[in-house]
């Protein structure tokens, strides 16, 4: 997962609503005991912001060493800074932990830009604002890195929450969440509410502000409104899903739905942007440009490189369209849609020359590795990673940024045929090179 800005054909027939939405009690199957309700101790346990990632406090070792750890659903290693680095305020000191065990094995993780490498071991790990348990987990002690840690981000490590298939150096290295579920009675699911501020946060504001919640082992009703809608996890490696239709302001992009998932579509909290395959990106930008044609923005803006600024409080949200992604539903021929606002896909940024104004970067970008539903998508929704039932749930987040005219939405059901054909089958080659 990249931090900062990290991601024979046939068409899915999208569209006709099946009818009224059902109340929550009837459109969701009953849950096992202990999976729902209130998780007060875990609410508000995340800090950060979309551009630099959201992090949770964890402790490692005996006596416990406290570290802030980036929550990343797009990777599967628990890796922490374990040597001095200019951007780290603190790091894991294995020699101070009486419970550290060396696995005598190295790990090297290259990204398109940057890399980290380290030494594998295990130690006792807990999450102070999480379940009241301690687990022995695999830890990659990062001894060397390049363009991995972010200056001022305030996190010192990464918690990869995806599946073992994409763990490094190979799938035999059990990810943290697998260890947690195996060693405790914590149910096999977690949920994320990432809260974008809607305005730039400086260092001290990030430290003081709440960034959201990671509910481990359950679903907290206070974090969302309306109904939760579930899409199947297509394959347990990344959190892979299938997009069956895309609309800009209600206008279908009318592309072969395989294009939306070429070569995969994933939900990734460790990526900032909504990243789209080249053809889809070009079609989407063309449509967004047309919808907002009252203004002529520089090309660099649409490439995500250039800020555009408005006098404070005058951002014309109404000229920018809403974007709807239709996801495969749990029932045959049934889909649902999630709709985000420009408040999600225009990312607030600030530099010294623009501090009196409201400035944004376009947070949709091109990808050569498929669709990545990053933080800008997740900030609109409460997202349930229901690993036990191999599905991901979406509901409107109680903390999403909106205006008085429009709100993010999760709506369904819709009739969509031949959705299985929207999935792309990646040729079986070696998956060992990280291309995020």
């Amino acid at each position: 997962t990249q931090h900062g800005i990290r991601l024979p054909l046939r068409s899915g027939l999208g569209g006709a609503p099946l009818g009224l939405r059902l109340p929550r009690e009837t459109d969701e199957e009953p849950e096992e005991p202990g999976r729902r309700g209130s998780f007060v101790e875990m609410v508000d346990n995340l800090r950060g912001k979309s551009g630099q990632g959201y992090y949770v406090e964890m402790t490692v070792g005996s006596p416990p060493q406290t570290l802030n750890i980036l929550v990343d659903t797009g990777s599967s290693n628990f890796a922490v800074g374990a040597a001095p680095h200019p951007f780290l305020h603190r790091y894991y000191q294995r020699q101070l932990s009486s419970t550290y065990r060396d696995l005598r094995k190295g790990v090297y993780v290259p990204y398109t830009q940057g890399k980290w490498e380290g030494e594998l071991g295990t130690d006792l790990v807990s999450i102070p604002h999480g379940p009241n348990v301690t687990v022995r987990a695999n830890i990659a002690a990062i001894t060397e890195s390049d363009k991995f840690f972010i200056n001022g981000s305030n996190w010192e490590g990464i918690l990869g929450l995806a599946y073992a298939e994409i763990a490094r150096p190979d799938d035999s290295l059990e990810p943290f969440f697998d260890s947690l579920v195996k060693q405790t009675h914590v149910p096999n699911l977690f949920s994320l509410q990432l809260c974008g501020a809607g305005f730039p946060l400086n260092q001290s504001e990030v430290l003081a502000s709440v960034g959201g919640s990671m509910i481990i082992g359950g679903i907290d009703h206070s974090l969302y409104t309306g109904s939760l809608w579930y899409t199947p996890i297509r394959r347990e490696w990344y959190y892979e899903v299938i997009i069956v239709r895309v609309e800009i302001n209600g206008q279908d992009l009318k592309m072969d739905c395989k294009e939306y998932n070429y070569d995969k579509s994933i939900v990734d909290s460790g990526t900032t942007n909504l990243r789209l395959p080249k053809k889809v990106f070009e079609a989407a930008v063309k449509s967004i440009k047309a919808a907002s044609s009252t203004e002529k923005f520089p090309d660099g803006f649409w490439l995500g490189e250039q800020l555009v600024c408005w006098q404070a409080g005058t951002t014309p949200w109404n000229i920018f369209p809403v974007i709807s992604l239709y996801l495969m539903g749990e029932v045959t021929n049934q889909s649902f849609r999630i709709t985000i606002l420009p408040q999600q896909y225009l990312r607030p940024v600030e530099d010294v020359a623009t501090s009196q104004d409201d400035c944004y970067k376009f947070a949709i970008s091109q990808s050569s590795t498929g669709t990545v539903m990053g933080a800008v998508i997740m900030e609109g929704f409460y997202v349930v990673f229901d690993r036990a039932r191999k599905r991901i749930g979406f509901a409107v987040s109680a903390c999403h940024v909106h205006d008085e005219f429009r709100t993010a939405a999760v709506e369904g059901p819709f009739v969509t045929l031949d959705m299985e054909d929207c999935g792309y089958n990646i040729p079986q080659t070696d998956e060992s090179t990280l291309m995020t």
Partner: nanobody
Framework: QVQLQESGGGSVQAGGFLRLSCAAS????????MAWYRQAPGKERELVSS???????AYADSVKGRFTISQDNAKNTVYLQMNSLKPEDTAMYYC??????????????????WGEGTQVTVSS
């Protein structure tokens, strides 16, 4: 593609002078304002002086009376005449322009661009 070409930096003795220039090119939009910022090692970037398209100027208190900003609209160039330089003026100096992208090129919406910077070193 917007390009900013800065020049005129260098090393001088305290009390000396330098003239920085920044030429902007590669765009058809209107220029809303041009400015100079500076950043000394370990410090935040700060505004030195700015000039708007209507000719109005602003200066940081620390440079008032010593520095003068001006522009050549025909050449899309901004200048910073720095007199009576002091060691505390030592910094990397950056050109910043705001390009109007509002309706009809108005400045109600703008895009800010930065130059690469030019080093000014003042020794005592």
């Amino acid at each position: 593609q917007v390009q900013l070409q800065e020049s005129g930096g260098g090393s001088v003795q305290a009390g000396g002078f330098l003239r920085l220039s920044c030429a902007a090119s590669g765009y058809t939009y209107s220029t809303c304002s041009m400015a100079w910022y500076r950043q000394a090692p370990g410090k935040e970037r700060e505004l030195v002086s700015s000039i708007r398209n209507d000719g109005s100027t602003a200066y940081a208190d620390s440079v008032k009376g010593r520095f003068t900003i001006s522009q050549d609209n025909a050449k899309n160039t901004v200048y910073l005449q720095m007199n009576s330089l002091k060691p505390e003026d030592t910094a990397m100096y950056y050109c910043n322009i705001r390009i109007g992208v509002g309706p009809g090129g108005t400045c109600s919406i703008y895009a800010p661009y930065w130059g690469e910077g030019t080093q000014v070193t003042v020794s005592s």
